[in-house]
């Protein structure tokens, strides 16, 4: 629903970081946390991290899952720790608002 969309919020959250952009760090700080899954040549590549600036993740977080990619976003310290992005299963619809979690 429209009113469930996260508002621009300068607060920074600690996020779990796992993936190519994390370097040697296992956490990052940003205005949103995410958990993503992409299919690379048929192999599942899971990543977690943060968007430093809210606008950075705005469009990504609104994008519904596709057969090759899914992103779930949240706001709250370590909120992406127990989130695992999942691809849509056949016959289910995934409106963009369903993959945003507020904590």
């Amino acid at each position: 629903m429209e009113d469930e969309k996260p508002k621009v919020n300068p607060k920074l959250y600690m996020c779990v970081c796992e993936g190519l952009s994390c370097g040697n760090e296992d956490h990052c700080e940003g205005q949103q946390c995410f958990s993503s899954l992409s299919i690379n040549d048929g192999f599942h590549v899971y990543q977690k991290g943060c968007f430093q600036v809210y606008e950075q993740g705005k469009m990504t977080c609104k994008t519904p899952p596709s057969p090759g990619q899914a992103v779930e976003c949240c706001q709250g310290d370590w909120c992406n720790r127990n989130i695992t992005a999942q691809l849509p299963t056949k016959g289910k619809s995934f409106p963009g608002t369903q993959n945003f979690h507020l904590e």
Epitope: E18, G19, N40, D41, G42, V45, Q47
Partner: antibody, heavy 118, light 106 residues
């Protein structure tokens, strides 16, 4: 127990075709991506192709793109590799494999030998 | 494509030895790396996934470490059944295997 059994290998002339099959059992086949990996005699391993759960998305190594086609029949718990325009360098043992989402290539079949020679 | 290199290409060791095999990626692959063992006439067998996670049923003498471009497979105390070829495999992008490391009896 997960079982993957490949068949269909054999001797074929350059330019010829062959269709490999991999019969799966011991797991819910339609829930898993499937893969073909090959190994030339005395050589290393090479990923060949992947297919998603419903067969709607397929992926190929550049070396086989346009010549090989991966497909699956979930009602028969079988994945296939149709190989056309075969070359001597396609000679290899072809393995079928499965992943779990978190564990790539967790299970392999015993392989089937394809020999391309005149 | 991401290139994978392994060193050494072969090594001789005795039962009970600690064995270390290195795998290097040509670019950052984070922890998207598996280790496989292959014995003559057999299919490869998964030992380690996601760089350092031990596959179910694999003895704890096998361990993996590394992130980014440098990875290591360690066998803490080599057993007679461990003489084989070991391959690393990356699935970060354009899946590729390393050329293999043959572990032979000294």
């Amino acid at each position: 127990e997960v079982q993957l059994v490949e068949s269909g290998g054999g001797l074929v002339q350059p330019g010829g075709s062959l269709r490999l099959s991999c019969a799966a059992s011991g797991f819910t086949f339609s829930n898993y991506y499937m893969y073909w990996i090959r190994q030339a005699p005395g050589k290393g391993l090479e990923w060949v192709s992947s297919i998603n759960t419903d067969g709607g998305s397929t992926y190929y190594a550049d070396s086989v793109k346009g010549r090989f086609t991966i497909s699956r029949d979930n009602s028969k718990n079988t994945v296939y590799l149709q190989m056309n325009s075969l070359r001597a360098e396609d000679t290899a043992v072809y393995y079928c494999a499965k992943s779990t989402p978190n564990i790539p290539l967790a299970y392999w079949g015993q392989g089937t030998l394809v020999t391309v020679s005149s | 494509d991401i290139q994978m290199t392994q060193s050494p290409s072969s090594l001789s060791a005795s039962v009970g030895d600690r064995v270390t095999i290195s795998c290097k990626a040509s670019q950052n692959i984070y922890k998207y790396l598996n280790w496989f063992q292959q014995k003559p006439g057999e299919a490869p067998k998964l030992l380690i996934y996601y760089s350092n996670s031990l596959q179910t049923g694999i003895p704890s003498r096998f361990s993996g470490s590394g992130s980014g471009t440098d990875f290591t497979l360690t066998i803490s105390s080599l057993q007679p059944e461990d003489f084989a070829i070991y391959f690393c495999f990356q699935y970060s992008s354009g899946p590729t295997f390393g050329p293999g490391t043959k572990v032979e009896i000294k």
